[in-house]
């Protein structure tokens, strides 16, 4: 009689998470009598997966009826596979005894589990940054297997190249995680921009997963300030306007100062949005010229999104005859750009990022 062989025909089997895995095993002889057991791993720490003789194995079903006459098929089916089921499975023949004695093992079948990555989660910087600055976005996805995975970044549909990606762990594992950090240079036009993290994996059948983040959460566009005087009214009142333009987010507080004293404070709310996502706001102040003997120094002070205040000052010339006054006298400090503003006294210099 030929010696018993335990044959596991497949060296490896790959199964999608949630599906069933069939692990094949046949014996070449009915002799000797004794049960089959399936183990994951080898050595003293091996895990019993199924025993024909005894035990409760709710997820494991023998492929062939164990009571079938002449049965030499000891294949099993494991249901509802998860990444934790990955490993090498051994079909082991025992000889009947008290207790049964291990006789021969199959060569083993490695079960790998194809698990889909979780939906990518994109997170942006904790604090806002201004145009021309670089911010980092992080994309994370977890629980996938096998390890091979492709991650791409896009900004408004254009692929980005400045990013770094890590897949963990480096060694063998039941499942893996990916983390990628992309560096994005902001522009003033990015309020409506979006970054997309795209993950492609064998389990996704060519339909990648995407995570998105809006740059509106990461950007601050500081306002332009312009203070102008309208024509003197017949009642000796001057209408001075402060135009605050192209700012984002909307959170903004404007304070009028007359000769350094607070005249009025306003909070921006429910402003219409510009096409580029920024906001404009105009505030005006009526100054009664006849109530002043000296020139009146008006300051429009804007505090945007919790940043240090930006001042723009304007002097209303009381000494000049109202009728002769120009309709659009400019503010004293006109040498400003979108980031740097000086008040008249050059007391403060504010640089905004």
């Amino acid at each position: 009689e030929e010696e018993l062989q335990v044959i596991q025909p497949e060296k490896s089997v790959s199964v999608a998470a949630g599906e069933s895995a069939t692990l094949n095993c046949t014996a070449t002889s009915l002799i000797p009598v004794g049960p089959i057991q399936w183990f994951r791993g080898v050595g003293p720490g091996r895990e019993l997966i199924y025993s024909q003789k005894e035990g409760h194995f709710p997820r494991v079903t023998p492929v062939s009826d164990p009571t079938k006459r002449n049965n030499m098929d000891f294949s099993i089916r494991i249901s509802n596979i998860t990444p934790a089921d990955a490993g090498t499975y051994y079909c082991v023949k025992f000889r009947k005894g008290s207790p049964d004695v291990e006789l021969k093992s199959g060569a083993g079948t490695e079960l790998s589990v194809r698990a889909k990555p979780s939906a990518p989660v994109v997170s942006g910087p904790a604090v806002r940054a201004t145009a021309e600055h670089t911010v980092s976005f992080t994309c994370e996805s977890h629980g996938f297997s096998p390890r091979d995975i492709t991650l791409k970044w896009f900004k408004n549909g254009n692929e980005l190249s400045d990013f770094q990606t890590n897949v963990d762990p480096a060694g063998k594992s039941v499942s893996y995680s990916i983390r990628s950090t992309a560096r994005v240079v902001l522009t003033r036009r990015d309020v409506h921009s979006q970054v997309i993290c795209e993950v492609a994996h064998v389990t996704l059948q060519g339909d990648p997963l995407r995570g998105t983040a809006n740059l509106s959460e990461a950007i601050r566009v500081p306002p332009f300030l312009e203070v102008t005087q309208q024509s003197m009214r017949a009642d000796n009142q001057v209408n001075v306007t402060c135009q605050v333009t192209k700012f984002y987010p909307q959170r903004l507080q404007l304070t009028w100062l007359e000769n350094g004293n607070v005249s009025r404070t306003e909070m921006a709310s429910a402003l219409p949005e510009n096409k580029d996502g920024t906001y404009n706001w105009t505030s005006w102040l009526l100054v009664n010229v006849s109530a002043h003997r000296d020139d009146v120094k008006l300051t429009c002070q804007v505090e945007h999104d919790g940043q240090p205040a930006v001042n723009k000052s304007f002097s209303v010339k009381v000494s000049a005859h109202p009728k002769e006054q120009g309709s659009n006298t400019a503010a004293e400090n006109t040498g400003t750009n979108e980031r740097d503003y000086k008040d008249d006294d050059d007391k403060h210099h504010h640089h905004h990022h």
Epitope: E1, L30, D65, T67, R69
Partner: antibody, heavy 119, light 110 residues
Framework: QVQLVQSGAEVKKPGASVKVSCKAS????????INWVRQAPGQGLEWIAM????????HYNQIFKDRATLTTDTSTSTAYMELRSLRSDDTAVYYC????????????WGRGTLVTVSS | DIVLTQSPDSLAVSLGERATINCRAS??????????IFWYQQKPGQPPKLLIY???NRDSGVPDRFSGSGSGTDFTLTISSLQAEDVAVYYC????????FGQGTKLEIK
């Protein structure tokens, strides 16, 4: 360790029925056939029938086909053999035996239940 | 049905001597490359005990003085050196079809 524990001795009158139980332990009850064999005093072994507890498939010796019924209760891992219309020549020790190799053989035996049929 | 006939019905052998029991089937019990014959030993007041399965394979814990041989229709159980504890009735059983037993052979010490 495989164990088959049988019910106690019975005394029955001719024409009556007897139901012998066999409680299994030490193995997965539904994975192995249970056989029933009897032995009249001073006589040889006589196979009665076998049952697969997983699906209650049965095979009977033609001699007992009309009088014997095998059943199992998988919740208690117990096999039963009922014999009806008893006659005096049914007096015997009734054994249950487990087939460990699915070879239609008897690897592990209960200790037997003596059924005496007497008027 | 297959009928099994054992011979002799009884046998007396001296301690240490060889004992041979035969079992003949009314038709071949070979199938699928196996000979479907089993041998049991039954001592007084005890249930039978499996000795040999598939004609020639000793069950676990069975001393190696017991051996089985044969094929087709003729089979033999041999005890190479009889021990006092071997006194018993020996039965052959076939399972090529549904199980049937031989009538038994009583083995005693001479």
């Amino acid at each position: 360790q495989v164990q088959l524990v049988q019910s106690g001795a019975e005394v029955k009158k001719p024409g009556a029925s007897v139901k012998v139980s066999c409680k299994a332990s030490g193995y997965t009850f539904t994975n192995y056939w249970i056989n029933w064999v009897r032995q009249a005093p001073g006589q040889g072994l006589e196979w009665i029938a076998m049952i697969d507890p997983s699906d209650s498939e049965t095979h009977y010796n033609q001699i007992f086909k009309d009088r014997a019924t095998l059943t199992t209760d998988t919740s208690t891992s117990t096999a039963y053999m009922e014999l009806r219309s008893l006659r005096s020549d049914d007096t015997a020790v009734y054994y249950c035996a487990m087939d460990y190799g699915s070879l239609y053989a008897m690897d592990y035996w209960g200790r037997g239940t003596l059924v005496t049929v007497s008027s | 049905d297959i009928v099994l006939t054992q011979s002799p019905d009884s046998l007396a052998v001296s301690l240490g001597e060889r004992a041979t029991i035969n079992c003949r089937a009314s038709k071949s019990v070979s199938s699928s490359g196996y000979n479907w014959i089993f041998w049991y030993q039954q001592k007084p007041g005890q249930p039978p005990k499996l000795l040999i399965y598939l004609a020639s394979n000793r069950d676990s814990g069975v001393p190696d003085r017991f051996s089985g041989s044969g094929s087709g229709t003729d089979f033999t159980l041999t005890i190479s050196s009889l021990q006092a504890e071997d006194v018993a009735v020996y039965y052959c059983q076939e399972s090529r079809e549904l199980p049937t037993f031989g009538q038994g052979t009583k083995l005693e010490i001479k």
